[in-house]
């Protein structure tokens, strides 16, 4: 299928102009190649009318042009002074006319309606409100005012000043007569329907002295806005329906083959299961506008979308709507999503998040998709280090391995951590990818004590047991803070031969703090990695207390118990500023842990890696 996309149908009136926008994948070849607009003939050939190389056919001379916008991957064809002869089938495309990199466009130019002299034309979108102004002379001020609709040769009364309202307009029309001195009355029609389209007649008084004014009401279906997005990318539908529906339930729906509209998401809590984990309806502003974000776009997401407002949370005639036509380009550089990452209860996951490799300096974020209500995605961590309070000690975002990938590590997993998470940046908003964390049966591979109390001024050893399958991995200990996990110095690089052979059931890498200081209190992680690729981690909390008994402490895994409920936090808690994407309302504001500053380090902390039997080994 061609990746070029444009409007399928364009309609206008004689004498008017049209502007036709066509989209293409903005590869360097596409950006520089010829763009064209051609008309399909009976023979099937497509005759060029205008091209980006400056060609304009004789019957377009002086009234048409083609402008390329390579940075956007679009080009625009403008045609003025339309005539009925311009109706027909066209193509906008790239390269040569017969190659197939094109999109079919149907243009229909109709004759403008023949209206009585002095007719006021009102052009309004379906669902909106129109105010028809009806002037009158002083002598007709006390007389009956009325609005009629002309249907063929007859006039049907719509409303009058004697409180008559035509049933077709019930609860959505009112006639206003201003105070004395103002010689004009108005008729306001709300929630316009397509059937309201037509010629109306205002009348004040009767007989030969009556005042009359014609009004032509054109009720338009909203022209769908064309949206061109990459496969696996992200789209945002911004929906502004007006203050009059600010307090009415909102929805986004997709038009199906039966021309009805299936709800995708609404503010009443309904959501299509096909969008699970990858859709958010942002809280609306005071003016009633809202937006819907869909990530991980699929080819089957293509189609016509409508947003609207109605108390039922679904499409109803006569309520305001906005329309989009979504095209999903399969020539995409964005990696597939969602991925599924598996972890075990008590264990950890290291999630590799893709981002646009051209945006290495962008801020990186990770948020938890919550399906309740309209969906939200509160930030959990960002590359500058802010972490939500309840994730203290178990979540970290690392810039490695870089070149289009960053890493998020989450440990101390519970079944509550299962769900969808989004990787995103403050750069290219199309690069929002979804990852699903699944908690599977099994035991964590790394074993550390759950809770350790260290004594000020003494020596502390914390063991971390790992299985043989990790013998070829690098082992490390680090001290967690909300800005990352600072690796602690190790005594030696590279495994010894005995270590590689791994003939024992278990191996050990131990952390030594000597002497223990107040600054050593906090979370420590034991982990394995391959270069900048991080694997499993295990966390242990170290509490520091005053000296009671002399001597050094060795904490054996047998003494492990649960990590403490009360975690010592800095009092300087601040709000996350929602810098993640262009629409800051996407994320709820969440509390974060302020930087605890001091790191364990220097020569006091050392990591010792050895077999269970040989505590004195010196390999990492």
């Amino acid at each position: 299928k061609s990746p070029v996309f444009g409007p399928q149908e364009v309609s206008s009136v004689e004498g008017n102009s049209v502007s036709i926008k066509c989209y293409y994948p903005p590869t360097s070849v596409n950006r520089h190649t010829r763009k064209y607009w051609c008309r399909k003939g009976a023979s099937g050939r497509c005759i060029t009318l205008v091209s980006s190389e400056g060609y304009v056919s004789s019957n377009y001379a002086g009234r048409a042009n083609l402008t390329n916008f390579p940075e956007n991957g679009t080009f625009v064809v403008n045609i003025a002074q339309l005539s009925r002869d311009d109706s027909g089938h066209y193509k906008c495309g790239l390269g040569i006319n017969s190659r197939g990199l094109s999109f079919d466009v149907s243009l229909e130019v109709s004759q403008g309606p023949e209206l009585p002299n002095g007719t006021e034309v009102y052009t309004v979108d379906v669902g909106r409100t129109v105010t028809i102004k009806c002037p009158f002379k002083t002598e007709n001020a006390p007389k009956t005012k009325a609005l009629y609709k002309k249907i063929g040769q007859t006039s049907v009364l719509v409303i009058d000043s004697r409180n008559y309202v035509n049933p077709n307009y019930k609860d959505r029309i009112r006639l206003r007569i201003p105070g004395t001195g103002q010689l004009i009355f108005t008729v306001v029609i709300d929630r316009l329907r397509l059937s309201d389209h037509g010629l109306y007649l205002c009348q004040a008084g009767d007989g030969s002295n009556r005042d009359e004014k014609n009004a032509d009401l054109q009720v338009l279906e909203p022209e769908p806005e064309l949206v061109y997005e990459d496969l696996r990318g992200s789209v945002t539908f911004h929906c502004a329906l007006g203050l009059e529906v600010a307090n009415v339930a909102k929805f986004l729906c997709r038009v199906n083959s039966r021309e009805t509209c299936d709800v995708v998401i609404n503010t009443l809590g309904k959501r299509d299961s096909a969008f699970e984990g990858r859709i958010l309806l942002n809280p609306q502003d005071k003016d009633g506008s809202f937006s819907v974000v869909i990530t991980g776009l699929r080819k089957e997401d293509e189609g016509r979308y409508l947003c609207g407002a109605h108390s039922d949370g679904q499409l109803q005639e006569g309520w305001p709507i906005q329309a989009w036509q979504l095209f999903v380009n399969e020539e995409s550089t964005i990696p597939r999503s969602p991925t599924v990452v598996k972890g075990v209860a008590g264990g950890s996951v290291a999630v590799l998040c893709p981002y646009n490799p051209k945006e290495s300096q962008s801020l990186k974020y990770w948020c938890l998709w919550e399906g309740a209500q309209n969906g939200r995605c509160p930030l959990l961590v960002e590359s500058q280090g802010l972490v939500q309070e309840q994730y203290e000690g178990r979540l970290s975002l690392l810039q490695e391995p870089g070149n289009g990938t960053f890493t998020v590590i989450l440990n101390q997993l519970t079944t509550q951590d299962a769900g969808f998470y989004w990787c995103l940046t403050n750069g290219d908003t199309r690069w929002r990818t979804t990852v699903e964390i699944k908690i599977i049966e099994g035991e964590p591979n790394l074993k550390v004590p759950g809770n350790v109390t260290a004594v000020l001024g003494e020596t502390l050893n914390i063991p971390c047991h790992f299985p043989c399958k990790f013998s070829s991995y690098e082992k490390y200990w680090c001290k967690w803070s909300n800005t990352g996990c600072q690796t602690l110095p190790s005594q030696d690089e590279g495994p010894s031969e005995a270590f590689v052979n791994c003939d024992e059931n278990s191996r050990l890498v131990s952390l030594t703090l000597n002497p223990v200081t107040r600054a050593d209190e906090g979370w420590y992680w034991c982990g394995v990695k391959q270069g900048h690729f991080y694997g499993e981690t295990a966390a242990v909390y170290v509490a520091v207390e005053e000296k009671k008994v002399a001597g050094s402490r060795y904490v054996s895994p047998a003494k492990a118990d649960a990590a403490p409920d009360e975690k010592v936090l800095d009092s300087g808690v601040r709000e996350i500023e929602n810098k993640a994407i262009q629409d800051p309302r996407l994320f709820a504001e969440e509390k974060v842990v302020a930087d605890t500053g001091d790191q364990a380090g220097g020569s006091r902390a050392s990591v010792d890696s050895s077999s269970s039997e040989e505590q004195g080994g010196s390999s990492k």
Epitope: P335, R336, S337, P338, T339, V340, V341, K342, G343, V344, V349, A350, L352, P354, P357, E400, P401, G402, N403, G404, T405, T433, I440, G442, K529, Q530, H532, F533, Y534, G535, E536
Partner: nanobody
């Protein structure tokens, strides 16, 4: 779900070359980091190489660095391991893995034998 099938193994003389392929089925191949591991008789499965979703970053075990090259073709849903200057100690079953640093999805493996 990702299914992985390795191929390209065989018998080769020391100093020779082989190219292993790992074909993935399942829509999400291109979003995963991919890795190669190997398991010699009587030993634990050990890490050999890893590559990110876009090939932007790679890493190799010290024992294969400079001799092995990992690459991928997302259009073909395939990851490769080019093995040059093979040594007898490279003899092992080679496994392909999706999401190699967590709980990986594994292939069935392909046997590589290097004779001296």
């Amino acid at each position: 779900q990702v299914q992985l099938v390795e191929s390209g193994g065989g018998l080769v003389q020391a100093g020779g070359s082989l190219r292993l392929s790992c074909a993935a089925s399942g829509r999400t191949f291109s979003s995963y980091a991919m890795g190669w591991f190997r398991q010699a008789p009587g030993k634990e499965r050990e890490f050999a190489a890893v590559i990110t979703w876009n090939g932007g970053s790679t890493h190799y075990a010290d024992s294969v660095k400079g001799r092995f090259t990992i690459s991928r073709d997302n259009a073909k849903n395939t990851v490769y391991l080019q093995m040059n200057s093979l040594k007898p100690e490279d003899t092992a079953v080679y496994y392909c893995a999706a999401d190699p640093m967590n709980s990986p999805y594994w292939g069935q493996g392909t046997q590589v034998t290097v004779s001296s």
